[in-house]
């Protein structure tokens, strides 16, 4: 059920373009995210018995399409690898090692947080360009599958409690929860 079902309709692999380099590390100066209204970063491996778990994140570069229109620039998408397990057993070529016990729980690497990126779409035949915000995976996490193997049945590691709305870790330059920006002159 999730947005992933839409992915193939809206993306196009760019021939000859490899994976993007990993994004640069974020500034060490962290914000008080509760005060700033962001979602605190989610740490699915904080529980002591799963601290070794690792989740594979791959980057792909694609043009996005919306009907006949195509993005003016390629977009880097993060894709969560299907398997996850103890980091020390996770091979470079993922999938070669079946690390879990036959009767043990099954874990899957799935999207944890999402982010939006503005995309300018150019359309053929002189049609007006479009502006969209694309939903991209911001991070991945390991979840335990129940016997139903449903997305809605995936279980998180560790408890989650009420928290300030949203905030994955703010990207560099991100604003905190604050007054309406509309008071500023339109920058576009």
């Amino acid at each position: 059920q999730g947005w992933q079902a839409f992915r193939n309709d809206a993306t196009e692999v760019i021939p000859g373009l490899g994976e993007y380099p990993e994004p640069p590390p974020e500034n060490n100066q962290t914000m008080n995210r509760a005060e700033n209204g962001g979602r605190p970063p989610h740490h699915p491996y904080d529980a002591k018995d799963v601290s070794e778990y690792s989740c594979r994140e791959l980057h792909y570069t694609r043009f996005l399409t919306d009907g006949p229109c195509r993005s003016a620039k390629p977009v880097t998408e993060l894709v969560c690898s299907g398997q996850c397990g103890p980091a020390r057993l996770l091979p470079n070529a993922i999938g070669r090692v079946k690390w879990w016990r036959p009767n043990g729980p099954d874990f899957r690497c799935i999207p944890d947080r999402y982010r939006a990126q503005r995309v300018q779409l150019l359309c053929p035949g002189g049609a007006a360009p479009r502006s969209r915000k694309v939903r991209l995976v911001a991070s991945c996490k390991c979840k335990r599958l129940t016997r139903f193997h449903n997305q809605s049945e995936l279980k998180d590691f560790g408890p989650e409690t009420a928290r300030p709305q949203k905030g994955r870790k703010p990207r560099p330059g991100a604003r905190g929860a604050k007054a309406n920006q509309a008071e500023l002159e339109n920058a576009y």
Epitope: Q1, G2, W3, F6, R7, D9, A10, N36, G37, G38, R39, H42, D66, P111, D112, R113, Y114, R115, A116, Q117, R118, A128, P129, R130, S131, R132, K133, V134, R135, A138, S152, P164, Q165, K166, G167, R168, K169, P170, R171, A174, R175, G176, A177, N180, Q181, A182, L184, E185, N186, A187, Y188
Partner: antibody, heavy 121, light 109 residues
Amino acid sequence: EVQLVQSGAEVKKPGASVKVSCKVSGYTLSELSIHWVRQAPGKGLEWMGGFDPEDGETIYAQKFQGRVTMTEDTSTDTAYMELSSLRSEDTAVYYCATDSAGYWYKFFQHWGQGTLVTVSS
Amino acid sequence: QAVVTQEPSLTVSPGGTVTLTCGSSTGAVTIDHYPYWFQQKPGQAPRTLISDTDDKHSWTPARFSGSLLGGKAALTLSGAQPEDEAEYYCLLDYGGSFVFGGGTKLTVL
């Protein structure tokens, strides 16, 4: 299909606080961008605040800054909007709204049924 | 704070065409304001008709269309039906903050 179910009507005294809940089903809360909108009787829609996925932050309308807090409980897929220091002009129907969880962000696609908050002494 | 302006009221004959507009006090409305249009009938929650200037939804009747006209966002209704009588609101995105217009009361008469 995303569905939003809000808590029931509330009657509050001036100066009190109110906390309205919005239960999400069909998707998990972390997949969605929740916004809160209110409508005073006979008036127009007014955006109060919500999650901006571009920056990963909650943004509040200037008018409500310092009085409103938007939180979530991901274990129950429930979003909350708390408004403090209530006054009579806060009497309104409060709506939560969310995107459709599609590949392209389309905000305000699904709406809760609304929660009437009456502020009266 | 930005002010988003709409016509307070408009009247259209059944089968006729009408255009509702949405302007911004900060200047011309562009595709980067991702204009939204909502329909609201008395006692009901709003319903999204148009997102991102011109993007219709599965439930949006074909007679509604969105565009940009003369520095404003526009909602055009072609072939008005009695059930289209409602309040219509536009919404503009100012970098993650949103501002609603005051609404247009559309009468089909």
